[in-house]
């Protein structure tokens, strides 16, 4: 969980920087006895794995370049996405509010955590490691990392539920704007994400360690209570279960239900009348599904390397170096892919959603809100050209699709 663990008897609790948001460097230290740490007095120093240095060294510079790219793309992309949703009234609706929430979570991570990580990577030490601001950053860094992943995960779940609700509740009429239920969802998502990240803020401290007689300090997870020891032990499985499997299972369940719902409603004049409406709804569902798939692809390698490390890797095995090299490489690829997830959603929306693409293009040219022609030719809120029933007062069929404003 971060650089070095207990300073003097550290034999097996080291996790160099694993605060889990794609910026961790856990294998720098976890998988072999790190050279920057003190070891048990029995001198049980394992034979050094030569590949480790080469991989670590190469990663240092590759990761810095990637992190800087992610910082720029993530900041511009997520900020633009928020601006689009905020500035265009017709874009303010349920699913877009959830997407804005997703973007804000990513933006916070990109703006605060990425620079800290790049500093740690290049300087080889924790920023402000000898004063109170360093202690504050030490707690803030993992807290925001976990919060950001939590926000991503829970928003994806909420979007999947939202897509099912949009298909299941045909009769509900809602105007443009964010529904109360979505607002409550978003507030709940953020509160829950922050609550789940509290153990990180509690557990991470500036720990002194010694190397060659010199005293250093670094930020790491240091379990001092029974709960924190338990958290440390189950952390990898908890992260894998809640922050990876849960959103995938949630999407699978609600998309299966949604498909069943759509198949059940295949017949009837309503189906014909709502064909355009359904087409756009399907497009939105596709976009959400795309975001979930991207999330899965970005995070799978990192989770896999962690689980393999936990289950397969044996520190005492004399032939462990080959496996270590593979896990190190996989971990580093996973780190970069996971970090990439914080800047990829705006890019995905640009390519998957015509509406967002148009808005991105005009917004990046600083005239998204001015281009009235665009607003009229391409309706921003999916089905703002509503299906009209002969009976204008028949609310059962007059469904504004503020929920479907992505395509």
């Amino acid at each position: 969980d971060n650089p070095e663990r207990y300073s003097t008897n550290l034999s097996n609790h080291v996790d160099d920087f694993t605060t889990f948001r794609g910026t961790e460097l856990s294998f720098l230290v976890t998988t072999h006895q790190p050279t920057n740490l003190v070891l048990p007095s029995n001198g049980s120093m394992h034979n050094y794995c030569p590949q480790q240095t080469k991989i670590t060294s190469a990663f240092k510079y590759i990761n810095t370049v990637i992190s800087c790219t992610i910082f720029i793309v993530g900041m511009v992309g997520n900020a633009t996405l928020l601006r689009i949703i905020y500035q265009n009234k017709c874009m303010r609706n349920g699913p877009n509010a959830l997407i804005a929430s997703l973007a804000l979570g990513d933006l916070i991570y990109v703006v605060i955590d990425l620079p800290i990580n790049v500093f740690k990577l290049l300087a080889g030490r924790w920023p402000f490691d000898h004063n109170d601001f360093g202690v504050f950053l030490c707690k803030l860094f993992p807290f925001l990392q976990k919060s950001s992943v939590g926000i991503t995960v829970l928003n994806l779940c909420a979007l999947s539920v939202d897509r099912y609700r949009a298909v299941a509740s045909w009769s509900r009429v809602q105007g443009i704007g964010i529904p109360l239920v979505t607002a409550i969802e978003i507030v709940s998502i953020w509160i829950l994400s922050f609550i789940l990240a509290i153990p990180e803020a509690i557990g991470f401290v500036m720990v002194p360690f010694e190397y060659r007689g010199e005293q250093h300090k670094t930020c790491m997870l240091n379990a001092t209570s029974k709960f924190m020891e338990f958290y440390q032990d189950v952390k990898d499985w908890w992260l894998f279960g809640f922050y990876f499997c849960m959103p995938l299972v949630c999407t699978a369940i609600f998309y299966t239900l949604m498909t069943c719902e759509m198949l059940n409603r295949r017949n009837g004049s309503l189906r014909i009348a709502l064909s355009e409406h359904l087409k756009q709804r399907r497009e939105v569902a596709k976009t959400v599904f795309c975001l979930v798939v991207i999330f899965a692809l970005c995070w799978f390698p990192l989770h896999l390397s962690r689980i393999l490390k936990k289950t397969v890797y044996n520190e005492m095995d004399k032939n462990r170096c080959e496996l270590l090299s593979f896990l190190l490489l996989m971990d580093y690829i996973g780190i970069n892919l996971a970090t990439m997830n914080s800047c990829i959603n705006p890019i995905a929306l640009y390519f998957v959603s015509k509406k967002f693409k148009n808005c991105f293009q005009s917004c990046l040219c600083c005239c998204c809100y001015q281009s009235k022609s665009l607003m009229t030719s391409v309706p921003m809120n999916g089905t703002s050209i509503q299906w009209k029933n002969h009976d204008q007062n028949n609310h059962n069929t007059d469904r504004s699709s503020h929920k479907d404003s992505m395509n």
């Epitope: 650089p3 003097t8 008897n9 550290l10 160099d16 720098l28 230290v29 790190p34 050279t35 920057n36 003190v38 070891l39 048990p40 007095s41 029995n42 001198g43 120093m45 050094y48 030569p50 240095t53 080469k54 670590t56 060294s57 240092k60 290049l122 300087a123 080889g124 030490r125 010694e210 190397y211 060659r212 007689g213 010199e214 250093h216």
Partner: antibody
Framework: EVQLLESGGGLVQPGGSLRLSCAAS????????MSWVRQAPGKGLEWVSA????????YYADSVKGRFTISRDNSKNTLYLQMNSLRAEDTAVYYC?????????WGQGTLVTVSS | DIVMTQTPLSLSVTPGQPASISCRSS???????????LEWYLQKPGQSPQLLIY???NRFSGVPDRFSGSGSGTDFTLKISRVEAEDVGVYYC?????????FGQGTKVEIK
């Protein structure tokens, strides 16, 4: 002035044991890591072992691992190297050195001869 | 283990002339604290080794400023701007970034 004085060297038969001592003065011993380095006659320097400031952790060269034990007594300002199962190739001058990001101060060395 | 290779193995220099010794490590020796623990030691005839340069380029106290160290990653150099008679001896490079620590084989410097 920093002073390191090694003692305990001598002639020993293969398979025998020897305990080297390094008496430190002129600095705060407990604030420094310590190392042992050896030099075989007419050869280059070879790092042997190191120990942390509080003595809790130790490191060894592969060639001595399992046979040598480094320790320290901060109350006596003394560093030790317990050498067991000595071999002919352990014949060398053994130096102790202070560690503070580098081996900044060295003793004069003590000669260990392993021969039958 | 990390192998430290010094070149040349011996060097004959005219007093007042510059001298340069190269040291190459078999792997990158940047330590995870951000430091590169690359040191240069001089062992004068019949004496104990003495520290000249630590962390690649820092001169140890009392070391004349004619000695300078440079390099990064795997390639390092010790330069003596003007060799003096008292500089004779064997120069060793040393890496203290990864266990087990290792010395170079040494470069013998003598005066012409």
């Amino acid at each position: 002035e920093v002073q390191l004085l090694e003692s305990g060297g001598g002639l020993v038969q293969p398979g025998g044991s020897l305990r080297l001592s390094c008496a430190a003065s002129g600095f705060t011993f407990s604030s420094y890591g310590m190392s042992w380095v050896r030099q075989a006659p007419g050869k280059g320097l070879e790092w042997v072992s190191a120990i942390s400031t509080n003595g809790a952790t130790a490191y060894y060269a592969d060639s001595v691992k399992g046979r040598f034990t480094i320790s320290r007594d901060n109350s006596k300002n003394t560093l030790y190297l317990q050498m067991n199962s000595l071999r002919a190739e352990d014949t060398a001058v053994y130096y102790c050195a202070t560690e503070k990001g580098a081996m900044s101060h060295w003793g004069q060395g003590t000669l260990v001869t392993v021969s039958s | 283990d990390i192998v430290m290779t010094q070149t040349p193995l011996s060097l004959s220099v005219t007093p007042g002339q510059p001298a340069s010794i190269s040291c190459r490590s078999s792997q990158n020796i940047v330590h995870s604290t951000g430091n590169t623990y690359l040191e240069w030691y001089l062992q004068k005839p019949g004496q104990s080794p003495q520290l000249l340069i630590y962390k690649v380029s820092n001169r140890f106290s009392g070391v004349p400023d004619r000695f300078s160290g440079s390099g990064s990653g795997t390639d390092f150099t010790l330069k003596i701007s003007r060799v003096e008679a008292e500089d004779v001896g064997v120069y060793y490079c040393f890496q203290g970034s990864h266990f087990p620590f290792t010395f170079g084989q040494g470069t013998k410097v003598e005066i012409k």
